[in-house]
């Protein structure tokens, strides 16, 4: 039901301290709708890198994509791989590092084009959430303004939050990602209390706005862990 979908609203985990990579959202949707496969988050550093299994790009960090580690390898065995830099070969946008996109099989800079009319090579479905400016930690390169006729309004498809107008973020919405409002003070948010605690969020909320954090509502402290209500509150 819609209510159960709405109640599962969540935002992917917050970015780690500066220098760490964005965490992985939890899991992938199976071919049978409604079945969630549990997974976990990982914070990746150069010193401590472990291959992270995945099924979709959305499960990987902002500078990664999901693919088989060997060329022509078993599609059933996929891990998060480092994104491809400019002039490297690609099959889709998600393979290219932020600030680039996949054109004719090559990662090219987004700001090398004026993007007149519709540009075909775009991914609206890599459901990962990008906290591009959250808490001042920029994880993605802001794309050139030349790329857009206008910023996406609420309800329009997006790839990352920089595609959306001010006050909106790019969040998962079923099979796609669309621009949704950044949460305001008092609005309900979801805080994942431990790694791996969340399944795939098919209907995802944005993060709390500037100066706000997702914290347990004061009058809900006595509630059980599973029913605790989190809201966006002033720091």
């Amino acid at each position: 039901t819609l209510n159960s979908v709405l109640n599962s609203n969540a935002i992917k985990n917050l970015p780690p301290p500066l220098g760490g990579a964005a965490g992985h959202p939890g899991s992938a949707v199976s071919a049978a709708p409604g079945i969630l496969y549990p997974g976990g988050n990982k914070y990746q550093t150069i010193d401590n890198y472990q291959p992270y299994p995945c099924a979709e790009d959305e499960e990987c960090g902002t500078d990664e994509y999901c693919a088989s580690p060997t060329r022509g390898g078993d599609a059933g065995v996929q891990i998060c791989l480092a994104c491809r830099k400019r002039r490297k070969r690609c099959m889709r946008h998600a393979m290219c590092c932020p600030g680039n996109y996949c054109k004719n099989g090559i990662c090219v800079s987004s700001d090398q084009n004026n993007f007149r009319g519709e540009i075909e090579e775009t991914i609206t479905e890599s459901f990962g959430n990008d906290h591009s400016t959250l808490d001042g930690y920029s994880r993605r390169t802001t794309l050139s303004s030349k790329m857009y006729h206008s910023k996406g309004q609420e309800g329009s498809v997006c790839l990352r939050s920089s595609d959306c107008a001010t006050g909106l973020c790019c969040a998962r919405h079923f099979w796609s990602k669309i621009c949704k409002p950044v949460l305001k003070e008092g609005q309900v948010c979801t805080k994942h209390r431990r790694k791996g605690s969340h399944g795939l969020e098919i209907f995802q909320r944005c993060y709390c706005g500037e100066g706000l954090s997702c914290r347990i509502q004061k009058d809900h402290h006595q509630a059980s862990n599973s029913s605790r209500l989190h809201t966006c509150q002033r720091h």
């Epitope: 819609l2 979908v5 709405l6 992938a28 949707v29 199976s30 071919a31 709708p33 099924a55 979709e56 790009d57 999901c66 099959m91 889709r92 946008h93 996949c102 993007f115 007149r116 009319g117 519709e118 540009i119 075909e120 090579e121 775009t122 991914i123 609206t124 479905e125 890599s126 459901f127 790329m147 857009y148 006729h149 206008s150 910023k151 996406g152 309004q153 609420e154 309800g155 329009s156 498809v157 997006c158 790839l159 595609d163 919405h173 079923f174 099979w175 796609s176 669309i178 621009c179 795939l200 098919i202 209907f203």
Partner: antibody, heavy 124, light 107 residues
Framework: QVQLVESGGGLVQPGGSLRLSCAAS????????LHWVRQAPGKGLEWVSS????????YYADSVKGRFTISRDNSKNTLYLQMNSLRAEDTAVYYC?????????????????WGQGTLVTVSS | DIQMTQSPSSLSASVGDRVTITCRAS??????LNWYQQKPGKAPKLLIG???SLQSGVPSRFSGSGSGTDFTLTISSLQPEDFATYYC?????????FGQGTKVEIK
């Protein structure tokens, strides 16, 4: 030019199977989520199924769940709908549709581009 | 499921008329609503995205408004090529659901 061309429709008996295909061209197929929407003769539009760009996430209408399977082959730029245990009420024109892009002018929306459809008739 | 109720189900109008079609959702859907035009034997064509965003190539006589549960598609001055059936689609909740359609006929 975005083009979506459905095929595979035809006459089939109740309980039978059909596999619809949607051949895509004019855009990088693997970058988009795709959908099947149907329209019974003289009736309105009904969403059937959706699949994410990578193919791992699939969604179905209750009316077809367990009978229909959506899939895609990104290497062939083709979307499929395997339809089993067909019923008379599945008779319809089946359209494949594609979402818009954040690089459209203005930024795009879901179910933005549609094929011309293929007719499936389930009758004894 | 979210039900979408379109009204009227059909209307007769003349060229130059101002035409208004409404779509009501059974619960709030914010602005997650598209409007489509469909002509006989043809595929639907997206006119308006997210309640009010006119799509590229669509004449400016078409406009959309509304948020929450009530939405309106307006054709400011009906042209001969506008006689068709119009559908709304909500994509706020799963499953996506269409209105039953409004057929705009020549008076």
């Amino acid at each position: 030019q975005v083009q979506l061309v459905e095929s595979g429709g035809g006459l089939v008996q109740p309980g039978g199977s059909l596999r619809l295909s949607c051949a895509a061209s004019g855009f990088t197929f693997s970058n988009y989520g795709l959908h099947w929407v149907r329209q019974a003769p003289g009736k309105g539009l009904e969403w059937v199924s959706s699949i994410s760009y990578y193919g791992s996430s699939t969604y179905y209408a209750d009316s077809v769940k367990g009978r229909f399977t959506i899939s895609r082959d990104n290497s062939k730029n083709t979307l499929y709908l395997q339809m089993n245990s067909l019923r008379a009420e599945d008779t319809a024109v089946y359209y494949c549709a594609r979402d818009g892009s954040h690089m459209d002018k203005p930024p795009g929306y879901v179910f933005a581009f549609w094929g011309q459809g293929t007719l499936v008739t389930v009758s004894s | 499921d979210i039900q979408m109720t379109q009204s009227p189900s059909s209307l007769s109008a003349s060229v130059g008329d101002r035409v208004t079609i409404t779509c009501r959702a059974s619960q709030g859907i914010k602005n997650y609503l598209n409007w489509y035009q469909q002509k006989p034997g043809k595929a639907p064509k997206l006119l308006i995205g997210a309640a009010s965003s006119l799509q590229s190539g669509v004449p400016s006589r078409f406009s959309g408004s509304g948020s929450g549960t009530d939405f309106t598609l307006t054709i400011s001055s009906l042209q001969p090529e506008d006689f068709a059936t119009y559908y709304c689609l909500q994509y706020y909740g799963m499953p996506p659901t269409f209105g039953q359609g409004t057929k705009v006929e020549i008076k």
